[in-house]
């Protein structure tokens, strides 16, 4: 139930995919990743107003209860709905390997 | 990679399962759900400090980048890792039906 994609807070303010450039040092990977030297990290950032990109029934419940009890129940949160794989060249105990990570880069976002 | 389950902020402050009692009116369901009259909604609430219950590599990246750029990159967020199904007795166009919802109640939480 991916509800409305219209952001009532104004363009770009609601939950969506952002790209953040990060070095291996930024990521804390310099000691085990050889390549790439820099990653364009895609991540989900933004507000989740009522029913915006609600991932499922649970997100809809959370929205309702947050409206009633904002100090107890947080608003839904902008998180990845799916991921893009990425391959890293990394140091291993036995040398160097190519390794694919399936859960590294956000592909699509929703509110939950 | 479900990292540490020790909460550095003190007992019960970090991401975990909470139960919130809600009526059909609270949930906005009074016009289409007949039973139950009240739901013990299990949801994920709490802080996600560094590496606490990190769901995957993406969550670990988010932690690192949040530390570097707290105004740009939010901390990981406490969300359901899995759900418990729940059956509702609901009104339909043709009468009344029993319907199972698989994404209504959080079963387990992680940070992402």
């Amino acid at each position: 139930a991916r509800n409305g994609d219209h952001c009532p807070l104004g363009p770009g303010r609601c939950c969506r995919l952002h790209t953040v450039r990060a070095s291996l040092e930024d990521l804390g990977w310099a000691d085990w990743v050889l390549s790439p030297r820099e990653v364009q990290v895609t991540m989900c950032i933004g507000a989740c107003p009522s029913q915006f990109r609600a991932a499922n029934m649970h997100a809809q419940i959370k929205t309702s209860l947050h409206r009633l009890k904002p100090d107890t129940v947080p608003a839904p949160c902008c998180v990845p709905a799916s991921y893009n794989p990425m391959v890293l060249i990394q140091k291993t105990d036995t040398g160097v390997s190519l390794q694919t990570y399936d859960d590294l880069l956000a592909k699509d976002c929703h509110c939950i | 990679a479900r990292n540490g389950d020790h909460c550095p902020l003190g007992p019960g402050r970090c991401c975990r399962l909470h139960t919130v009692r809600a009526s059909l009116e609270d949930l906005g369901w009074a016009d289409w759900v007949l039973s139950p009259r009240e739901v013990q909604v299990t949801m994920c609430i709490g802080a996600c400090p560094s590496q606490f219950r990190a769901a995957n590599m993406h969550a670990q990246i988010k932690t690192s980048l949040h530390r570097l750029k707290p105004d740009t990159v939010p901390a990981p967020c406490c969300v359901p890792a899995s759900y418990n199904p729940m059956v509702l007795i609901q009104k339909t166009d043709t009468g009344v039906s029993l319907q199972t919802y698989d994404d209504l109640l959080a079963k387990d939480c992680h940070c992402i």
Partner: antibody
């Protein structure tokens, strides 16, 4: 513009060694890794190995392990491939190529012109 | 090691023809596949990477598709300069491996 210029053709006797150079220009050498590929006459492409231009870490094809050494010299933006104990079946054109690695994966976007190494008694 | 099998090994075609070359990996390689074109006496040239992304400067008549184990390179309308040998290559794991090549010849 990006260029990889390799050293000239070599004729070697069996048992000898050869060292092929690959000089890079038009980009920051240490930011892109290098692979070496060879092609025997009338045959397909065979990957020989990879070297990090920054750290010098290497990965070699199993069949060449112990006979091949890849190095880089960042001060001259040059990569080297040395092959020892040459045999007649090492006769091939040897290529270096620049490695492009980002979120779209790995590919080899610029290639040297190739160096013909002939092993003959 | 991951084996890459290309078919056909050669194909005869005319200018304007649609040409399809397939590449099969011996195990799943996600979308970590590239296609190269090689002309006699020349170095290989990158055409497609990440299975379907067109390298900058490569004509749009070249396209790639597939993921997992089965991949395709398509030339939508063969041009005179396209007669060459084409290689697929997996960059999923070391050792990096190439297919045996497909020679596109003039009919």
């Amino acid at each position: 513009q990006v260029q990889l210029v390799q050293s000239g053709a070599e004729v070697k006797k069996p048992g000898a060694s050869v060292k092929v150079s690959c000089k890079a220009s038009g980009y920051t050498f240490a930011s892109y890794d290098i692979i070496w590929v060879r092609q025997a006459p009338g045959q397909g492409l065979e990957w020989m190995g990879w070297i990090s231009a920054l750290s010098g870490d290497t990965v070699y094809a199993q069949k060449l392990q112990g006979r091949v050494t890849m190095t880089t010299d960042t001060s001259t933006s040059t990569a080297y491939m040395e092959l020892r104990s040459l045999r007649s079946d090492d006769t091939a054109v040897y290529y270096c190529a620049r490695t492009r690695h980002d979120t779209s994966g790995i590919r080899f976007d610029y290639w040297g012109q190739g160096t013909l190494v002939t092993v003959s008694s | 090691d991951i084996q890459m099998t290309q078919s056909p090994s050669s194909v005869s075609a005319s200018v304007g023809d649609r040409v399809t070359i397939t590449c099969r990996a011996s195990q799943g390689i996600d979308s970590w596949l590239a296609w190269y074109q090689q002309k006699p006496g020349k170095a290989p040239k990158l055409l497609i990477y990440a299975a379907s992304s067109l390298q900058s400067g490569v004509p749009s008549r070249f396209s790639g598709s597939g993921s997992g184990t089965d991949f395709t390179l398509t030339i939508s309308s063969l041009q005179p300069e396209d007669f060459a040998t084409y290689y697929c290559q997996q960059v999923h794991s070391f050792p990096i491996t190439f297919g045996g090549g497909t020679k596109v010849e003039i009919k």
